[in-house]
């Protein structure tokens, strides 16, 4: 039976046409089956560290060793792949760091950073100084191994100079890379010495070589691409969010819910309310009201903003997130103070959210 009674039958609009709602990427650790993997929790000043995998508490077992800030997985299997998190609990707050583990036969490391394109990579030479091709920005080429989640965009760059201006071509696994070799083709931006592949799939895995040449010479550089296949999982909510808040009567406040979900999440903000002076219905279940939800008429559903609050707004606010796999929810309390008891700051605002893909 339901765990609550809705005060009013809120008619939910159809879901908004989805955007790519996840923005930043966790670090990706790749291991081959059978290998051991060690990850250090990259959080400082941790009094107590707890670990989760796909939102479920992770404890030590015969293959998982937890020592201080280190997580060791012995004899990794594909089942160990997933979204991991370590949470550092301190006396005043807690912080969570997320990373992905991918156990696959492919060798790779890291993931592709989104360099800002700059025409400064296009170097013009004095027409008298004939020169063989050379690299103009080796820093952008240092990372040879790229592990990128499926459906993301990959950009490989080989900024070069020379006189006359060199030409650039690309090879995949040592052979000419043709547009028809991948669905959707690829883009080459000669001005920025880059190869761009959108919406990568597992068949894009391999070695990509840029060959830069003019009549005075030829240079080349090879990148290895691994496409990390993801596992669908229940929504995962960042620990500590939404955070408890306090404000004075007439003040404004924001609650933030930070969601990690491959599958499109549906977000609801719910509050315990009273009906006819009672917090509970005849069935003993609490009365709840949906204040906001993701949908066509709702922008930025992961933030609940309350303006000009009254004492009646005090209470527990629940961020409930669902995708087709499962649900997750976390709550926070709002304390509303009389004007003369103003806290240190009137407006309690937490960091702006971003989705993770």
């Amino acid at each position: 039976r339901p765990s609550f009674s809705l005060v009013e039958d809120t008619t939910l609009e159809p879901e908004e046409p989805p955007t790519k709602y996840q923005i930043s990427q966790p670090e990706v650790y790749v291991a081959a089956p059978g290998e051991s993997l060690e990850v250090r929790c990259l959080l400082k000043d941790a009094a107590v560290i707890s670990w989760t995998k796909d939102g479920v508490h992770l404890g030590p077992n015969n293959r998982t060793v937890l020592i201080g800030e280190y997580l060791q997985i012995k004899g990794a299997t594909p089942r160990d792949s997933g979204l991991y998190a370590c949470t550092a609990s301190r006396t005043v707050d807690s912080e969570t760091w997320y990373f992905m583990v991918n156990v696959t036969d492919a060798i790779s490391s890291g993931d592709d950073e989104d360099d800002t394109d700059g025409a400064e990579d296009f170097v013009s030479e004095n027409s008298n100084n004939k020169r063989a091709p050379y690299w103009t920005n080796t820093e952008k080429m240092e990372k040879r191994l790229h592990a990128v989640p499926a459906a993301n965009t990959v950009k490989f760059r080989c900024p070069a100079g020379g006189n006359p201006m060199p030409t650039m071509r690309w090879l995949k696994n040592g052979k000419e890379f043709k547009q028809e070799h991948r669905i959707g083709g690829y883009k080459v931006r000669n001005q920025h010495w880059s190869l761009i592949m959108e919406s990568v799939v597992p068949s894009d895995k391999g070695n990509y070589t840029c060959v830069v040449e003019n009549e005075y010479g030829s240079i080349n550089h090879t990148y290895h691409l691994d496409v990390v296949e993801r596992s669908p999982h229940r929504p995962i909510l960042q620990a500590g969010l939404p955070a408890n808040a306090s404000t004075v009567v007439g003040g404004d406040v924001e609650f933030v819910c930070k969601v990690y979900s491959d599958a499109q999440p549906h977000i609801q903000w719910i509050k315990h309310v009273e009906k006819n002076g009672s917090k509970y219905g005849p069935d003993g279940l609490p009365y709840l009201k949906v204040l906001k939800h993701s949908g066509i008429n709702s922008s930025n559903a992961e933030v609940l903003a309350l303006f000009n609050v009254t004492e009646a707004d005090a209470g527990e606010y629940i961020c409930k997130v669902s995708n087709y796999i499962g649900q997750a929810n976390q709550s926070a309390w709002l304390t509303v103070l009389p004007k003369q008891q103003a806290p240190g700051r009137e407006k309690e605002i937490t960091a702006s959210p971003d989705y993770l893909e």
Partner: antibody, heavy 116, light 106 residues
């Protein structure tokens, strides 16, 4: 391993009701949505709705509201779908399906035949 | 609701040939999911999150696309690949399936 085992075939008369069960094992039943799908003979797949056993949240395809009722018994890790006021067009194979850990699992299907 | 249209309805090819199955959505979806079904059997999850192969699915299968247009490709058909393939979206309730593409031996 994860298993979804559905109840056997049913033959019902028009106007009657039928309750199809889906017994699960090998995973935490309460932590994942259980979805139900209809497939009429020789036809494609049609989404009916889902139940979240932990709190009994339900989400129905509007077309099946009033026709299907989804429930769950957490003590036996079993999901149920009751179809009411049966008509000949309800004759179909009904599947339960859900994600557990990182994979999708389907029951073997239950054939419900509505015939006078 | 989001309507998924699969084309062609029937695709007749020979083993060894390349197969391209399309799924078009009436409005944008985040990801597409694909299932294979053989007569008398339950659908089997085949591709999830647009491009990821379900466990045990051979590498000759691949999925791609974004927005409203998605594709399932089989690089070189094997006899066991002949079946009905359905696409599905989990982005916006009510979750919907395409009408299916029947891949048959020529």
């Amino acid at each position: 391993q994860v298993q979804l085992v559905q109840s056997g075939a049913e033959v019902k008369k028009p106007g009657a009701s039928v309750k199809v069960s889906c017994k699960t094992s090998g995973y935490t039943f309460t932590s994942y949505w259980m979805h139900w799908v209809k497939q009429a003979p020789g036809q494609g797949l049609e989404y009916i709705g889902a139940i979240y056993p932990e709190n009994a949240d339900t989400d129905y395809n509007q077309k099946f509201k009033g026709k299907a009722t989804l429930t769950a018994d957490t003590s036996t890790s079993t999901a149920y779908m009751e179809l009411s006021s049966l008509r000949s067009e309800d004759t179909a194979v009904y599947y339960c399906t859900g994600y557990a850990y990182d994979a999708a699992y389907w029951g073997q299907g239950t054939l419900v035949t509505v015939s006078s | 609701e989001i309507v998924l249209t699969q084309s062609p309805a029937t695709l007749s090819l020979s083993p060894g040939e390349r197969a391209t199955l399309s799924c078009s959505a009436s409005s944008s979806v985040s990801y597409m999911y694909w299932y294979q079904q053989k007569p008398g059997q339950a659908p089997r999850p085949w591709i999830y999150l647009t491009s990821n192969l379900a466990s045990g699915i051979p590498a000759r299968f691949s999925g791609s696309g974004s927005g409203t247009d998605f594709t399932l490709t089989i690089s070189s058909l094997e006899p066991e690949d002949f079946a009905v393939y359905y696409c599905q979206q989990w982005s916006s309730p009510p979750y919907t399936f395409g009408g299916g593409t029947k891949l048959e031996i020529k």
